[in-house]
Interface confidence: medium
Amino acid sequence: EAHKSEIAHRFKDLGEQHFKGLVLIAFSQYLQKCPYEEHIKLVQEVTDFAKTCVADENAENCDKSIHTLFGDKLCAIPKLRDNYGELADCCAKQEPERNECFLQHKDDNPNLPPFQRPEAEAMCTSFQENPTSFLGHYLHEVARRHPYFYAPELLYYAEKYNEVLTQCCTESDKAACLTPKLDAVKEKALVAAVRQRMKCSSMQRFGERAFKAWAVARMSQRFPNAEFAEITKLATDVTKINKECCHGDLLECADDRAELAKYMCENQATISSKLQACCDKPVLQKSQCLAEIEHDNIPADLPSIAADFVEDKEVCKNYAEAKDVFLGTFLYEYSRRHPDYSVSLLLRLAKKYEATLEKCCAEGDPPACYGTVLAEFQPLVEEPKNLVKTNCELYEKLGEYGFQNAVLVRYTQKAPQVSTPTLVEAARNLGRVGTKCCTLPEAQRLPCVEDYLSAILNRLCVLHEKTPVSEKVTKCCSGSLVERRPCFSALTVDETYVPKEFKAETFTFHSDICTLPDKEKQIKKQTALAELVKHKPKATEDQLKTVMGDFAQFVDKCCKAADKDNCFATEGPNLVARSKEALA
C-alpha cells in the first residue's frame, strides 16, 4: 500500500536502532572514503528528520522518496569533488538516474587499509565506554570495504559482535575468549560478503529472471515438501528483497526481509517442518536462521522425474503453453529431489533441458528426440563430482596452506596477466574451500564446493572487470554465471603469455617478515610463489617445490639468527641465485 511518507513508514516498521544502522550502512556503501564521524552526523540528521515525519507525515519534504532524501544529503557534503572526483557528477542528475550513478561508482576494491582488530583490552575499553559508537564503527568499516554487503545481515553480524564482546569483556583472559569467537564471526561475514556480491552480480548482469531461477532451485532444495506455487512465492519475495538491497534500497530491503520471515513463520505448515526453532527468535536472528535453515526431509513418495518431463505425451504442449512455468516446475521438481547438487549444477541441467525441448519440439518425432535427455545430464553431473573428488583429495594431502599454493600455481598459469595481489587473494579464498567443504558428509560436499567456488570466482571477475588484462578471464566472466566455474576449471596454461623478467628485488626479503603474523607471512610467500610462476609459467611442480622449500628454510634460518638484517642481506642474494638456477 502507498504511504504519504515513505521514510516515516520505514522508521516505524524498523525501529530507531535498526533504522540508524541501515542508514549508516547505506551512506558507508555509497561514500566509502568518508570518515565515520562525517557519516554519523548525516545519520543523525536523517533520523531526526524521520522522527519529524513520524510526528507529521505532511511536514515539508516528508513525501520525498528515500533515494531523493539520501541523495540530497550525500550531495550536500562539502568537498565532495575533491574526495570523490567523478562521483560528484552524479549530483547533477535527477532521481532515479542519480542513484544509478551512485551505484555505478561503488568500488569493490577500495583503497583502504585492511581492517585491523584492536588489541583485546583496548577493544573492551572502547566497547564498554560506548557500545553504540563501537558497533557503529564496525558497521561503517565493514560496509565501506564491502559496498554490496547484505545490509540486514550486516546488522545481524553487528549483533553477534555485540554478544561476543558483552560475554568476553568480563573474562580475565579477554583475548583467549575474543579471538576464536571474533574470528568465527569474521569468517562467516567474509563468506556472506562474496555470496551477496554474486547475487548482486547476477541481478545486475542477467536480471531478475536469472536470480529468480537461482532462488527457485535453492528454495526447492530446502523445502521439498512445499508446493511449486509456494516455492515461487518465496522465490519472488527473495528476488524482490535482493533487488532492493543490491539497488541501495536498504530500508525497504530490511523491512521486506522481516515481512518474509513473518510470512514463513505464519505458514510453516505449507513450507517446512524445520522452521519452528527459527521462528521463536527475535527478528534479525529469525531471518538469519531461516536463511541458513537445514533442508527438510524429501517426501518419500516422489515419482520419477521422467514421468512428467520425458514420458508424458504432452511435454511439448505443456512447454509451449507456458515456457517459464513449465521450466520452473522442472527446476522445482529436479531440485527438491537433489539437495546433494549445487544450485549452479541444477541451473545447468534446467538449461540443458530447455535447449533439448527447443530443439526437439520443432522436430517430427519429439518424444524420440527428447527421450534421452536425462541420460544426457550424466556428463554435466560427473564433471563437478570429479572436481570435488580430486580437489578434496589434494586438500587432504596438502592441508589448507599447501592446497592454496597448488591453486595459486594453477590460477597463475591460467591467467598470469592478472595482478599478483588479486591472484593471491583469489587463491587463498579458493583454497579455503577445502577446510569449509571437504570435511562435510559426502552429500553436502558438491553444493558446498561448487557454490562457494562460484562466489569466489565472481569476486575475481568483478575485480578483473575494473582493469581487464586477461582475455581468458574476460571470456569466462562474460558468459553465463552458472558456466563460469566450469569455464575457469577448463582453462589451461596461457600459451600466449610472455614470461616476466626475473627481478631480484621481487624476491628480496628483510627482517620485518619475522615479526609478521602467520597470515601475513603466508601472503608474502604466496606473493613470491605467484611471481615465480609468472617468471616461469611452465615450471614443474618439483621445481617450484624446491624453490619454495629453499625460501621457507631461508626465512626460518634468518628469523632465528642473532643478526637478522645481516642474514637477510647476505643469504638473500644466494637464495635468488639458487632459485634462478633451479628454474633454468
Epitope: E227, F228, E230, T232, K233, T236, T270, F326
Partner: nanobody
Amino acid sequence: EVQLLESGGGLVQPGGSLRLSCAASGFTFDTSSMLWVRQAPGKGLEWVSVIHQSGTPTYYADSVKGRFTISRDNSKNTLYLQMNSLRAEDTAVYYCAKFPSRKMKFDYRGQGTLVTVSS
C-alpha cells in the same frame, strides 16, 4: 468434502469482457494455491492461470497474458478471473481447481462455466 462452484460465464462479443467467480468450500481456501483451467470444444484441458494462497505471485499461460487477471478474496473463499479483450479462441468451459505440487495437474475441479466468444 471439497466443493468448487463456478459462475459468470455467458455469450460475449470479441473484444468484450467477463468476470468469472468460483466459490470454494470444504477445505482451507487461504492455504491453497488455486488455478483456472479451460477445455475448448473437442480439445484437451489447458491451464489458464495460477494464484498463490496469499494473492501473489500469479502466473498466466502465454495465450492469455496481458488480457486475463486472476485474483482471490480469502475472506469470502472466492477465486476470480477477469477476462478482457476476449477472442473466439477463448471459447471454452472454464473450471476452477485446487492446485497441488505436481506440474499443472490438479486435485479437484468444479463443474465449470461456459464462455462463448462470438459475434
